[in-house]
């Protein structure tokens, strides 16, 4: 399986909400002994491997933000802890999973990583990640809504 990031760059005004998205692609084994663990964290560029450094998102670690279920089942994070920090991660039946960040500030700017771990009990774990950048802007040059840039091209889309 692979992880796709539909958008590689999100440019948002301060105070806006944004939903960062990843998508699980390829054949997904739905066997009894296969589980998918999905989570989010911040990272930084300039390392040996993108997303190898795991930093908290608004003081919540990747363990706090994880989703757990088998295959393409829907799931949500522990609501109370995440929502107190203006965060919510979710997953649907089609392999899409996301993290929503509310009331963005300049401090939220940076590189974000989604992580999917395929757990084959009795065998091994297989971890795959996707990366995207969030730029939070303020002032007269800031967009009125979030603008997203697809990973495959530099055409931008306005999202509200």
């Amino acid at each position: 399986f692979k992880v796709a990031t539909p958008y590689s760059l999100y440019v948002c005004p301060e105070g806006q909400n944004v939903t960062l998205t990843c998508r699980l692609l390829g054949p997904v084994d739905k066997g009894h002994d296969v589980t998918f663990y999905k989570t989010w964290y911040r990272s930084s560029r300039g390392e040996v491997q993108t997303c190898s450094e795991r930093r908290p998102i608004r003081n919540l670690t990747f363990a706090d933000l994880h989703l757990h279920h088998g295959g393409h089942q829907a799931a949500n994070t522990s609501h109370d802890l995440a929502q107190r920090h203006g965060l919510e991660s979710a997953s649907d039946h089609h392999g899409n999973f996301s993290i929503t960040m509310r009331n963005l500030t300049l401090l939220d700017s940076g590189l974000y990583c989604c992580l999917v771990v395929e757990i084959r009990h009795h065998h091994s774990e297989h971890a795959v990640h996707g990366a995207m950048e969030l730029q939070v802007q303020t002032g007269k040059d800031a967009p009125s809504n979030c603008v997203v840039y697809p990973s495959s091209s530099q055409d931008s889309e306005n999202i509200t």
Partner: antibody, heavy 117, light 107 residues
Framework: QVQLQESGPGLVKPSETLSLTCTVS????????WSWIRQPPGKGLEWIGY???????NYNPSLKSRVTISVDTSKSQFSLKLSSVTAADTAVYYC???????????WGQGTMVIVSS | EIVLTQSPATLSLSPGERATLSCRAS??????LAWYQQKPGQAPRLLIY???NRATGIPARFSGSGSGTDFTLTISSLEPEDFAVYYC?????????FGGGTKVEIK
């Protein structure tokens, strides 16, 4: 803050079954791996096995024929049973939370089990 | 199973000195390696995961490096509370295995 607490008899007779329980407090057991690890006196650490919240288990091949790990999510507990024990099974037994693609981030304080007649 | 060999078995140093601990794997574990600290009578404590990520609350004087088969835990300037036994652990394959440990003792 998640905390783990092991409980069970500190003395087991040879050939009998060692039974320990780990109680998870301050957080949900419905995620992560929940592992048992042991440490014989003055020696290193040995992973015994885990149970995933879904009920899937995975055991160290060196102990697999004697080990059973089970979970009771309603009580936020998981348990270890080790059958046909010998003096070589004397150790401090730890329960721990293991995060996928990460490490054992939270440990119980450990409980000493002596196998002796 | 993957065998982890730690060296040296014992490291005798003074407070303020730099400690360098080694862990070598019998086959590549990529960067799926963790380090733990254990003091007498206590449970191990996670220091580093994924070779170099510091666990929550771990001081910056602890750092990890390496990938593949050779890994290093460095304590930049030893504090009195750092004298303990340190274990490495791999998680690329089950069974999960630990190294034999390195004891860091006061010189």
């Amino acid at each position: 803050q998640v905390q783990l607490q092991e409980s069970g008899p500190g003395l087991v007779k040879p050939s009998e079954t060692l039974s320990l329980t780990c109680t998870v407090s301050g957080g949900s057991i419905s995620s992560y791996y929940w592992s048992w690890i042991r440490q014989p006196p003055g020696k290193g650490l040995e992973w015994i096995g885990y149970i995933y919240y879904s009920g899937s288990t995975n055991y160290n091949p060196s102990l697999k024929s004697r080990v059973t790990i089970s979970v009771d999510t309603s009580k936020s507990q998981f348990s270890l049973k080790l059958s046909s024990v010998t003096a070589a099974d004397t150790a401090v037994y730890y329960c721990a939370r293991d995060i996928p693609a990460s490490a054992f981030d939270i440990w119980g304080q450990g409980t000493m089990v002596i196998v002796s007649s | 199973e993957i065998v982890l060999t730690q060296s040296p078995a014992t490291l005798s140093l003074s407070p303020g000195e730099r400690a360098t601990l080694s862990c070598r794997a019998s086959q590549s574990v990529s960067y799926y390696l963790a380090w733990y600290q254990q003091k007498p009578g206590q449970a191990p404590r996670l220091l580093i995961y994924d070779a170099f990520n510091r666990a929550t609350g771990i001081p910056a004087r602890f750092s990890g490096s390496g990938s593949g088969t050779d890994f290093t835990l460095t304590i930049s300037s030893l504090e009195p509370e750092d004298f303990a036994v340190y274990y490495c652990q791999q998680r690329i394959n089950w069974p999960l295995t630990f190294g034999g440990g390195t004891k860091v003792e006061i010189k």
